[in-house]
Interface confidence: medium
C-alpha cells in the first residue's frame, strides 16, 4: 500500500511567549490523529517549540510571521 | 495587568545566604519570563539572570555563577531569587521584572513591569 | 560580554531644552536595545523598546533611533518630571547588559 507520512504531534504548549526576534517560521498542527491542536514555531536556532493557537502572543506572533514572509501556511 | 510585590528589605552577615520573593498578579507565573536586576547604592543597573523562554531554563550572568539560584512556585505565582556568599559588595537594590504582556510585538525581552526593589544590606 | 557605554555621564538642561542621550554597543546588536528612566528611590520605567518603539503611555517627547551599534534617546522639550538618570539595555546576547547612565539635571 501506499507510504504512510508521519504525523507530528504536540503533547506540550509552551506557556511562555517567545520574543519575535526569535522566531523563524510557524506550521499548525491540525491532523485528527492529534491529542491538540497546535502550531509550531521553529526558532533561528532550529528549535521547535509547540504553542496553544487560543493564546494572543500566538496569533500575534503567527500574523507578524505571515506578513514577514506571505507564504500560505498549511 | 501584570503586578509584581516584593519581599521586605533584609539585613545579613556577610557569608550569609538570601533569599527575595516576587509575587506574580494578574497573570500566571508560567506565563512570563522573570529577571532580576540589581542596583548597588549610587550604581547603575546590574542585570543577573533571567528565564530564557525559548531554551527553557534560567541563563545567569557568569558574574552570579554558583552563587545565585532563580527559582520559581508556580503554586503561588511567586518568583525567587536566592543568593548566597553574601559579602559587603552584594549590598544592593534587588528588582524583579518581566513583560506587561500588552506590548503590541513581542520583540523585547519582558523588563517592562518591575517590582518596588528589595533592599539587601550585608553588614558584619 | 557586551559592553554598552552612554555619553554624556551626566547633563544639565532646562526645561523646554533638546536633550540627546547616546549609547554605544561594543558589538552589533540590531536593534534589540530599550531606555529606560530612573528616579531617586523608585523602580526603572521603559520609554523605548526595540530601539525606537515608545511604550504605552510615556509621552510623545521621548523617542529613540539608532541601529547596530551606536543608539539615541531624545527628549525633544524636557519637562520638569523629566529630570532623572537614563539608562540603555541590550537584550541582543546575554548577559544582557546596562549602559553605565546618564543624569539628567537642572541647569
Known amino acids: 500500500g501506499p507510504a504512510s507520512v508521519p504525523t507530528t504531534c504536540c503533547f506540550n504548549l509552551a506557556n511562555r511567549k517567545i520574543p519575535l526576534q526569535r522566531l523563524e517560521s510557524y506550521r499548525r498542527i491540525t491532523s485528527g490523529k492529534c491529542p491538540q491542536k497546535a502550531v509550531i514555531f521553529k526558532t533561528k536556532l532550529a528549535k521547535d517549540i509547540c504553542a496553544d493557537p487560543k493564546k494572543k502572543w500566538v496569533q500575534d506572533s503567527m500574523k507578524y510571521l505571515d506578513q514577514k514572509s506571505p507564504t500560505p501556511k498549511p | 495587568q501584570v503586578q509584581l510585590v516584593q519581599s521586605g528589605a533584609e539585613v545579613k552577615k556577610p557569608g550569609a545566604s538570601v533569599k527575595v520573593s516576587c509575587k506574580v498578579s494578574?497573570?500566571?507565573?508560567?506565563?512570563?519570563?522573570m529577571h532580576w536586576v540589581r542596583q548597588a547604592p549610587g550604581k547603575g543597573l546590574e542585570w543577573m539572570g533571567g528565564f530564557d523562554p525559548e531554551d527553557g531554563e534560567t541563563i545567569y550572568a557568569q558574574k552570579f555563577q554558583g552563587r545565585v539560584m532563580m527559582t520559581e512556585d508556580t503554586s503561588t505565582d511567586t518568583a525567587f531569587m536566592d543568593l548566597s556568599s553574601l559579602r559587603s559588595e552584594d549590598t544592593a537594590v534587588y528588582y524583579c521584572a518581566t513583560d506587561d504582556m500588552l506590548t503590541p510585538h513581542y520583540l523585547y525581552f519582558g523588563m517592562d513591569v518591575w517590582g518596588q526593589g528589595t533592599t539587601v544590606t550585608v553588614s558584619s | 560580554d557586551i559592553q554598552m557605554t552612554q555619553s554624556p555621564s551626566s547633563l544639565s538642561a532646562s526645561v523646554g531644552d533638546r536633550v540627546t542621550i547616546t549609547c554605544r554597543a561594543s558589538q552589533g546588536i540590531r536593534n534589540d536595545l530599550g531606555w529606560y528612566q530612573q528616579k531617586p528611590g523608585k523602580a526603572p520605567k521603559r520609554l523605548i523598546y526595540a530601539t525606537s518603539s515608545l511604550q504605552s503611555g510615556v509621552p510623545s517627547r521621548f523617542s529613540g533611533s539608532g541601529s547596530g551599534t551606536e543608539f539615541t534617546l531624545t527628549i525633544s522639550s524636557l519637562q520638569p518630571e523629566d529630570f532623572a538618570t537614563y539608562y540603555c539595555l541590550q537584550h541582543n546576547t546575554y548577559p544582557f547588559t546596562f549602559g553605565p547612565g546618564t543624569k539628567v539635571d537642572i541647569k
Open positions: 494578574g497573570y500566571t507565573l508560567t506565563e512570563l519570563s
